[in-house]
Amino acid sequence: SSSPTSSASSFSSSAPFLASAVSAQPPLPDQCPALCECSEAARTVKCVNRNLTEVPTDLPAYVRNLFLTGNQLAVLPAGAFARRPPLAELAALNLSGSRLDEVRAGAFEHLPSLRQLDLSHNPLADLSPFAFSGSNASVSAPSPLVELILNHIVPPEDERQNRSFEGMVVAALLAGRALQGLRRLELASNHFLYLPRDVLAQLPSLRHLDLSNNSLVSLTYVSFRNLTHLESLHLEDNALKVLHNGTLAELQGLPHIRVFLDNNPWVCDCHMADMVTWLKETEVVQGKDRLTCAYPEKMRNRVLLELNSADLDCDPILPPSLQTS
């Protein structure tokens, strides 16, 4: 995933005893929070694997890349990064693997330059619908976010609220239409069973969509038509059985797309004929020669590109009177 990268060379670590003494005042220009490493030259602050339970209050105003990975933050409250003066330069924020289970409304408010946010590997049982939009208005101020990385944010089964996890994530993505400028969205490894049909229509700027390693069985009700400039669609390692004509036509109509379909349990029966024909003609599928059948048993490991219509049959459905018990 595209987490913020640092060219930091000369990091300075602050002494832990400085931490609380100045937290109430604006940070000094060269100050570095306790348990963090800072490089003003690289505009980077790293507070990594330090078991922090809250976001440091005394972050330097120059920070452009902030790593808060491998901590124990638990909750990200409203205005978690609001400072006076604001962190006006902060462009890339990585909070992955920090045991966050709740992100509240307005958690990322007052970050006018925030382009890249990584919340991966946090068990987000409670993601507020207004986590990214900051307000419950029907149309919010546009978020500056360009990349949103939400890989493996599904909480354990027993920690989920009594609602659809997919629905919770989609509500946060669509609230207030704030993410209209989003270009990269990664939702890999989240046990998604389906993709709510309205989500893609409202993210028209998407260039990269990663839905790999989920449990998607079908794309029948998903429309890609609005994603006019989609460049990559990662659907590897799902539970897809076949892509139907409507989906195939939509994908073929996107002039910049590359589609990644490896490791799906393709069912090679009569319903697969259109997809096989399409695969033989299209250039949009990366590694299409690697796609193989999983079912039925007699077709297992056959290469889709090598199939012809005679291979793709459906067993006739017997009328009830002829079925044996």
Epitope: Q116, E147, R183, P255
Partner: antibody, heavy 115, light 107 residues
Framework: QVQLVQSGAEVKKPGASVKVSCKAS????????MNWVRQAPGQGLEWMGR????????NYNGKFKGRVTMTADKSITTAYMELSRLRSDDTAVYYC????????WGQGTLVTVSS | DIQMTQSPSSLSASVGDRVTITCRAS??????LNWYQQKPGKAPKLLIY???RLHSGVPSRFSGSGSGTDYTFTISSLQPEDIATYFC?????????FGGGTKVEIK
Amino acid sequence: QVQLVQSGAEVKKPGASVKVSCKASGYAFSSSWMNWVRQAPGQGLEWMGRIYREDGHTNYNGKFKGRVTMTADKSITTAYMELSRLRSDDTAVYYCANGGAMDYWGQGTLVTVSS
Amino acid sequence: DIQMTQSPSSLSASVGDRVTITCRASQDISNYLNWYQQKPGKAPKLLIYYTSRLHSGVPSRFSGSGSGTDYTFTISSLQPEDIATYFCANDNTLPWTFGGGTKVEIK
């Protein structure tokens, strides 16, 4: 913002090859597609082809097939365009342009083919 | 290949004028029509993509419209810094093709 910096001007003899490079920075938000477009002196724009940097997939304009090769080195975020069997009418400024819609352009590389 | 026919090839207008350029494709390009601005000695810059979407940082006086085969580019109030050549391009059907350009000058 994506910045594209191209290699310097080249003077080549007919029949030779030229390889132009294009380095992308501000890369986190850049596109996977890198297009190459040329412009002969005083003329319009002509699309030569494109490469998908993640997997090396290419689409070439049929006019240049067999003469043009586009490659990319992900590790240094650089794309290359090589044009072989140069002729005098290949004299042009060659641009790289990042994005499906050719969103951001390099500064151009003048290639002069002259005996 | 799809042919892109741009007109006029040049025009002269006063500061503050509304300027319109048209581009016709030889077949339906499903709104995949972009407009670029090129100043002398410089690289082209994307202004509008997918018929009417403004590229980031582009002033709102630039706009686009159209569908099917016929597309229009408009500068609502010409500014001195808009002196340039404008190109349309199809990015729907490979190979991408450009119009011949429209040179815009100040009267």
